[in-house]
Each structure stands twice: as C-alpha cells, then as structure tokens.
C-alpha cells in the first residue's frame, strides 16, 4: 500500500525517500519513476542516480536534499493535476534481493483562491527531519538541520500552507517525522 502525500497546483511537491550509505559517499543507484515499482529499475523514469551523481533527470524533478548522505527525496516543481499518481523510489542496494522499493501516492489538489498570492515556501528547508532509514546497515535515526529562527506568525502561516501535508501534524513537535521502511 502507498503512503499518501499532498500538494496544491503550482506548489512544489515533496516525496521523501532515504537510505543510509554503508560509508559516507558510498552511494548506490537510485531511480524515481511515475508508476508503481516494477521488477526492474523504475517505470517511466523521471530521475536516476548512480554511485557518484544524478545521471538523468527531466525538467521539474530534482533532488534537493543531501544526496551524498542518502537523502534522495524527490521535489517536483510547480505541480499540475497531471502530476497526481503513484511514484516509485527504488534504492538498488548490493546483495541478494536487497532493493528498497517505496510506492508513494501524490495527490494534487486545485489551488485555493486567495486574495493575494503568498510566497511559496519550501518546507524541506524550513523544518528538520527525523528519519528512520533502512539500507546497508541497521536502522538509525538521524536529525538533519535545525529549526530556523522564525517567529510564531511564520510558523502559523507555514502550518496553514502545509495543513494538507503529512508533515502538518508534526509541526508542534518542531519537525516532521518521516518513517520509511
């Protein structure tokens, strides 16, 4: 079953996916595709990495996290209703039948009509993430980043902007908890 994520038309959508490299910089191939994870690779690939870098991507699809630490979360910029659907993150880990495959469901909602446009916020940069990862070694929890100096009004504004996101329920815990695997 897929984990569901939401974004509005015109926003950036964020689909989390992480692994723990066996050693710093010891990366493995990862692909993102539109459609559930198949047997080989990803279907309809939108982004692919190798053991060194991103080696294939299409417009609007980016990795904005720390790729070298195993953050291969996908950002889709300026989403449209056509971006709705299942996305596959596949981490091709060495060993026998070790691949991590995650199917994430992205739901795009029509943009809310507001009197004045609000500045887009990229919540991947605004909040720290507590993540439980599975990969080469045992699961571990790590915190990336720290809570920036923002006032309560900003937090309230962000909470409103993100209320349809799975992250919204965790704002009061001063960070979003994402558990994959």
């Amino acid at each position: 079953s897929e984990v569901e994520y939401r974004a509005e038309v015109g926003q950036n959508a964020y689909l989390p996916c992480f692994y723990t490299p066996a050693a710093p910089g010891n990366l493995v191939p990862v692909c993102w595709g539109k459609g559930a994870c198949p047997v080989f690779e990803c279907g309809n690939v939108v982004l692919r990495t190798d053991e060194r870098d991103v080696n294939y991507w299409t417009s609007r699809y980016q990795l904005k996290g720390n790729f070298y630490k195993g953050d291969v979360s996908l950002t889709i910029e300026n989403v449209t209703l056509a971006d709705s659907g299942i996305y596959c993150c596949r981490i091709q880990i060495p060993g026998i039948m070790n691949d991590e495959k995650f199917n994430l469901k992205l739901v795009i909602k029509p943009a809310k009509v507001t009197p004045a446009p609000t500045r887009q916020r990229d919540f991947t940069a605004a909040f720290p993430r507590m993540l439980t990862t599975r990969g080469h070694g045992p699961a571990e929890t790590q915190t990336l980043g720290s809570l920036p100096d923002i006032n309560l009004t900003q937090i309230s504004t962000l909470a409103n902007e993100l209320r349809d996101s799975r992250l919204a329920n965790d704002l009061r815990d001063s960070g979003a908890t994402i558990r994959i695997g």
């Epitope: 047997v39 080989f40 690779e41 690939v45 692919r48 880990i93 060993g95 039948m97």
Partner: antibody, heavy 120, light 107 residues
C-alpha cells in the same frame, strides 16, 4: 551492439552442480542500465526467469530456485555466471543468458542458448 | 507469483490476415507487460514493452494494448516471417513470469 554467448557442459549428473558462463562483448558488464539475467526454457515448454545481477551488486533470484541458485559476475573478464546446485532431471532445459536494457528505449539481448541435460 | 494465461493456444491464419492474441494476468500488472516472439531454435525477441511500446526495429504491423489484467497483441497483416510462438511476460512483480505461449501457424 551487445552480444552474449553461453558456455558450459551440456551434460550434468543428477545431484551435481550446473555451471554456466555468459561472455559479454560489445558492452561493459559494469555499466548501468543492463540487468544481466539467466532464463531457461524446458524442452517444448515456456520460459522461466532464473534471476539477474545488476552492476550495483543487486541480485534477484526466482523464489522457486533461490535455495539452489547463485549468479555472480567477473567484471575484469566481462562475464557473468550461473550455478545451480543439486540438479535433477527437471532442470534439463535450454539456458539463456540475456541482458535487459532499461535506460532509454527498452531493449534486450540474448545469447543463442545452450541445452543442458541432467542425466546419469 | 503472477500467472499469465494466453489465448488461444494456437492460431491458424493465412499471410495477410490479422492476428489477435490475448494475455490475461491473475492480478493487475499495470502496464508492465511485454510481448516476445520466438522461432524454433532461436532465442525470444522482444516486440512490445510496457503494453504498447514497440521495441527498436520492430515493424509497425505489431501493436500492443491493454492495462491491468487484460492485454492484446495485434499483428495487422501477417507476413510469412511472423509465424512463430508469442509469449507475454510481466515485469510488475518478482519473479517476472511468462505466459504459456500462443503458436501462430500457417493455415
């Protein structure tokens, strides 16, 4: 264009280990996008995927054979290998090595196949 | 594992006729279905992948359709070299599985 060639004994005794080699030319076995696979076809019957190995070291085996099969690779020789232990007459088949290419337009390359008979 | 059932088992047609082959999956395979052609003494040859995409070098007379559990391979006008066995294969779920094949023979 990638070419594959199977080699190994055509006759194996029951309970022994079947060992086959696939030699790849026209492409590097350590390049991404290719799933180096073994597939077999019992005489007059359908096809069965045995397993694959990817350049990352990711390996998948058919659950029906998992306890008996090993697929490995030697990048320096541009070869990959199949070992199937404790064979019986039911393992008599044409064994193909194949490469499924999934980057860009999907395509595949197959060896010509080698018949392995399990008999005493 | 996912079971693929092909029908008919044998199709007897003449050159120039249209061939329609069916493949049904025991559960949804989305669009992750391929069609292969195999001639006696040869390895299979990929014709169609992801239900409807022709592989490199495959003539336009071969087309595929369907999604979920029901798929069709159509050969619009049979050429003499098209008489062979055709297999469908899913790559939705491990292990990849093949149908039992449809033999297209000369009537």
């Amino acid at each position: 264009q990638v070419q594959l060639q199977e080699s190994g004994p055509g006759l194996v005794k029951p309970s022994q280990t079947l060992s086959l080699t696939c030699t790849v030319s026209g492409g590097s076995i350590s390049s991404g996008g290719y799933y180096w696979s073994w597939i077999r076809q019992h005489p007059g019957k359908g096809l069965e995927w045995i397993g694959y190995i990817y350049y990352s070291g990711s390996i998948y085996y058919n659950p029906s054979l998992k306890s008996r099969v090993t697929i490995s690779v030697d990048t320096s020789k541009n070869q990959f290998y199949l070992k199937l232990s404790s064979v019986t007459a039911a393992d008599t088949a044409v064994y193909y090595c194949a490469s499924l290419m999934v980057w860009g337009v999907m395509g595949d390359y197959w060896g010509q196949g080698t018949l392995v008979t399990v008999s005493s | 594992e996912i079971v693929l059932t092909q029908s008919p088992a044998t199709l007897s047609l003449s050159p120039g006729e249209r061939a329609t082959l069916s493949c049904r999956a025991s559960q949804s395979v989305s669009s992750y279905l391929a069609w292969y052609q195999q001639k006696p003494g040869q390895a299979p040859r990929l014709l169609i992948y992801d239900a409807s995409n022709r592989a490199t070098g495959i003539p336009a007379r071969f087309s595929g359709s369907g999604s979920g559990t029901d798929f069709t391979l159509t050969i619009s006008s049979l050429e003499p070299e098209d008489f062979a066995v055709y297999y469908c294969q899913q790559r939705s779920d491990w292990p990849p599985t093949f149908g039992q094949g449809t033999k297209v023979e000369i009537k």
